[in-house]
């Protein structure tokens, strides 16, 4: 299972990188368009990947003013990059019972990023627990 565990490690690295990017964007909330965006919270079990894709699809935008425009837009671009898939991710893609993106409460960029970080932390935690218990599901 070497290649499988390498894939899992790549996935973990990517999720941690996403947290770093979210943290970086939080420094620039005043340079983001103050639009309200769907921000999943208290995501039900097995709908994490669905919620994750809602965060990725959200139209987070730079206000395009000042010297931070490029840094912000590169970070937003990084956020939208697909992470390495996992068994759980592949399975969850076929779940039709998860809420649609539009059904989630909309929040301004600051809260949107906080909730995104919270989901990423939850996914990492689940991933670590599943590995501890010998499963490769997530």
């Amino acid at each position: 299972h070497k290649s499988s565990s390498q894939g899992q490690d790549r996935h973990m690295i990517r999720m941690r990188q996403l947290i770093d990017i979210v943290d970086q964007l939080k420094n620039y909330v005043n340079d983001l368009v103050p639009e309200f965006l769907p921000a999943p919270e208290d995501v039900e079990t097995n709908c994490e990947w669905s919620a994750f894709s809602c965060f990725q699809k959200a139209q987070l935008k730079s206000a395009n003013t000042g010297n931070n425009e490029r840094i912000i837009n590169v970070s937003i671009k990084k956020l939208k990059r697909k992470p390495p898939s996992t068994n759980a991710g592949r399975r969850q893609k076929h779940r039709l019972t998860c809420p649609s993106c539009d059904s989630y409460e909309k929040k301004p960029p600051k809260e949107f990023l906080e909730r995104f970080k919270s989901l990423l932390q939850k996914m990492i935690h689940q991933h670590l627990s599943s590995r501890t218990h010998g499963s490769e599901d997530s």
Epitope: N68, E69, I71, K77
Partner: antibody, heavy 119, light 111 residues
Framework: EVELVESGGGLVQPGGSMKLSCAAS????????MDWVRQSPEKGLEWVAE??????????YYAESVKGRFTISRDDSKSSVYLQMNSLRAEDSGIYYC??????????WGQGTLVTVSA | DIVLTQSPASLAVSLGQRATISCRAS??????????MHWYQQKPGQPPKLLIY???NLESGVPARFSGSGSGTDFTLNIHPVEEEDAATYYC?????????FGAGTKLELK
């Protein structure tokens, strides 16, 4: 494997026009930020223009020295990026590279096409 | 515009020794713990090749003898031990804001 191939360079008189093309392959072109960078013995490496992805609504950015004279554009269906150069000056001479800006830094470069502006 | 000043303009280093190239920015290219400075290697007749991104991260496939450091306005590229294939011109470039600018280059020759 990523490949960027420039074409369209050559000799042009001052005040003339020229259009450079860059054909891309080996990556998801529509997601890419594409740039033109030029190089001359006098000015070294010089960023010229950038066009961002469809997701960003294809905004364009230019170096002050070419603003109003050069136009960067792209055709995602052809995985190509272009540089229309008008009112050319001697100082625009050099090798023009098509590059992909991949998150941090210019990771992929073409081999370049030589533009010579001379009477 | 952020001006990048490289030094020295050229240097000659013996095989196996250390080469150190500096790049100074006219204003800080670092913010919130990230330094938006990158290093490239260019050999005659070839386009530049990315070596180091974000000041200290080694680009995939680049030998570990290349390393980058620095923050704010002062950055350094180190090559140790220098090998024959390292003879080239090295450029720094920032991406803190537009316009993106490059240093004038440092030509590395082998003694």
């Amino acid at each position: 494997e990523v490949e960027l191939v420039e074409s369209g360079g050559g000799l042009v008189q001052p005040g003339g026009s020229m259009k450079l093309s860059c054909a891309a392959s080996g990556f998801t072109f529509s997601d890419a930020w594409m740039d033109w960078v030029r190089q001359s013995p006098e000015k070294g490496l010089e960023w010229v223009a950038e066009i961002r992805s469809e997701a960003d609504n294809h905004p364009t950015y230019y170096a002050e020295s070419v603003k109003g004279r050069f136009t960067i554009s792209r055709d995602d269906s052809k995985s190509s990026v272009y540089l229309q150069m008008n009112s050319l000056r001697a100082e625009d001479s050099g090798i023009y590279y098509c590059t992909e800006y991949d998150y941090e830094g210019f990771v992929h470069w073409g081999q370049g096409t030589l533009v010579t502006v001379s009477a | 515009d952020i001006v990048l000043t490289q030094s020295p303009a050229s240097l000659a280093v013996s095989l196996g020794q250390r080469a150190t190239i500096s790049c100074r920015a006219s204003k800080s290219v670092s913010t919130y713990g990230y330094s938006y400075m990158h290093w490239y290697q260019q050999k005659p007749g070839q386009p530049p090749k990315l070596l180091i991104y974000l000041a200290s991260n080694l680009e995939s496939g680049v030998p570990a003898r290349f390393s980058g450091s620095g923050s704010g306005t002062d950055f350094t590229l180190n090559i140790h031990p220098v090998e024959e294939e390292d003879a080239a011109t090295y450029y720094c470039q920032h991406s803190r804001e537009l316009p993106l600018t490059f240093g004038a280059g440092t030509k590395l020759e082998l003694k």
